[in-house]
């Protein structure tokens, strides 16, 4: 509608690492003569409409969201209605709506994408001694406390992908972070290197682990 307040947010999701602070950007264009006494600003969860933070009646009404949110009071008069979310958790992931009312009202939604890097994978072998060519072994690649769910890839020493006989499980802990365990069953050749790559699809972060089997004995390469 003509003259309706225009609320602007980034189109792309805001990516925030678990435990860090995130800024959900939101802005509006104040008209000449605008004062904060005219402003009503509401941040709420888009899906449930649960109140997160508000500025009404000329003052910051504070956080209604675990006391982890704050506005930028010095910037409000210039049309900066952004929200600071502190100590981001997995449970914060989702869409937040910025609602602005002055003479009329408008809203826009910004998505928060939470991420956590995966640890360097640890590799275990079963059985792990007296190995001979032709033996079947299971190699387990474990990586911890990442988010969101990982993509896991296996390859041999020549870089050839290994897709058969792979079982991957991902379990969320109480914070919502995932522990990944991927098991590769292989028949040993004379010697070989087997690598697993754990990829965080949001951070585009790759964590690598590998094991080299040379008949007897077996060696693990030093940590990078």
């Amino acid at each position: 509608p003509t003259g309706a307040v225009e609320v602007q947010v980034p189109e792309d999701p805001v990516v925030a690492l678990v435990g860090t602070d995130a800024t959900l950007r939101c802005s509006f264009s104040p008209e000449p003569g605008f004062s904060l006494a005219q402003l009503n600003l509401i941040w709420q969860l888009t899906d449930t409409k649960q109140l997160v933070h508000s500025f009404t009646e000329g003052r910051d009404q504070g956080s209604a969201y675990a006391n982890r949110t704050a506005l930028f009071p010095d910037l409000l008069a210039q049309g900066n209605a952004s929200l600071r979310l502190q100590r981001v958790r997995v449970a914060d992931e989702g869409s937040f709506t910025c609602f602005v009312s002055i003479r009329d009202f408008g809203s826009a939604a910004v998505s928060l994408q939470v991420a956590a890097p995966y640890s360097k994978p640890s590799m275990t072998l079963e059985p792990n001694k007296d190995l001979r060519p032709g033996d079947t072994v299971t190699i387990t690649c474990s990586s911890y406390r990442g988010y969101p769910e990982a993509e896991v890839f296996w390859q041999d020493g020549q870089g050839v992908p290994l897709t058969g006989n792979v079982t991957t499980s991902q379990m969320a802990n109480e914070q919502g972070l995932f522990d990944v365990h991927s098991v590769l069953r292989v028949v040993l050749g004379a010697n070989g290197t087997y690598s697993c790559l754990v990829r965080n699809p949001v951070l585009q972060q790759d964590a690598h682990g590998s094991v080299t089997i040379t008949g007897q004995p077996m060696t693990f390469p030093p940590e990078a």
Partner: antibody, heavy 124, light 109 residues
Framework: QVQLVQSGAEVKKPGSSVKVSCKAS????????INWVRQAPGQGLEWMGG????????NYAQKFQGRVTITADESTSTAYMELSSLRSDDTAVYYC?????????????????WGQGTTVTVSS | DIQMTQEPSLTTSPGGTVTLTCRSS?????????ANWVQEKPGQAPRGLIG???KRAPGTPARFSGSLIGGKAALTITGVQPEDEAIYFC?????????FGGGTKLEIK
């Protein structure tokens, strides 16, 4: 359970104005947008505008800008829609609508609960 | 102007499942469009069925469900009843205004 009760049918002359009321009961009023929607005979639904009583701010569809005024009285939990410069093609059933109650929510824009409708006939 | 497209009419049988969709000319429908679904029967006031994409209004039977499918808002009726014969309108919120679709006439044969 939220209920919306609207004022009775009106017959108006072209060029005049009509004011329709919508009283909310059984729930919170302030932070729920009251939307006004009309339906002309044999036509679909058309959003005219809405108001958030908590802030007293209203938005209007471009088509009705300058001809419609939506207000609200928090003390009586009543919203009003006034349409001026009436024409014969404003003959329609006018509805108010709002979200159902959701405790702990911020601002609610939706249209889950509807009034019974007010028939406005514009005829000379 | 924003255009919303609904199937003009659909026919289904009692006990069947039917999905009505609502497409927006502006692109994919998201949760921030707060898709509403409204049922209208002849001689009756419209009745809100679904709000906020997928939340059933009080009194809406469990056979009605809302979702987003392929960038469109969708209303699915599972186990259709004869009394579900009606016109169904979708409405989407665009920052500061609501836009209604043209409605889908659902016939039950």
């Amino acid at each position: 359970q939220v209920q919306l009760v609207q004022s009775g049918a009106e017959v108006k002359k072209p060029g005049s104005s009509v004011k329709v009321s919508c009283k909310a009961s059984g729930g919170t009023f302030s932070n729920y947008a009251i939307n006004w929607v009309r339906q002309a005979p044999g036509q679909g639904l058309e959003w005219m505008g809405g108001i958030i009583p908590l802030f007293g701010t209203a938005n209007y569809a471009q088509k009705f800008q300058g001809r419609v005024t939506i207000t609200a009285d928090e003390s009586t939990s009543t919203a009003y829609m006034e349409l001026s410069s009436l024409r014969s093609d404003d003959t329609a059933v006018y509805y108010c609508a709002r979200d159902f109650d959701a405790p702990g929510s911020g601002v609610n824009f939706g249209m889950d609960v509807w009034g019974q409708g007010t028939t406005v006939t514009v005829s000379s | 102007d924003i255009q919303m497209t609904q199937e003009p009419s659909l026919t289904t049988s009692p006990g069947g499942t039917v999905t009505l969709t609502c497409r927006s000319s502006t692109g994919a429908v998201t949760t921030s469009n707060y898709a509403n679904w409204v049922q209208e029967k002849p001689g009756q006031a419209p009745r809100g069925l679904i709000g906020g994409t997928n939340k059933r209004a009080p009194g809406t039977p469990a056979r009605f469900s809302g979702s987003l499918i392929g960038g469109k808002a969708a209303l699915t009726i599972t186990g259709v009843q004869p009394e579900d014969e009606a016109i169904y309108f979708c409405a989407l919120w665009y920052s500061n205004l609501w836009v209604f679709g043209g409605g889908t006439k659902l016939e039950i044969k």
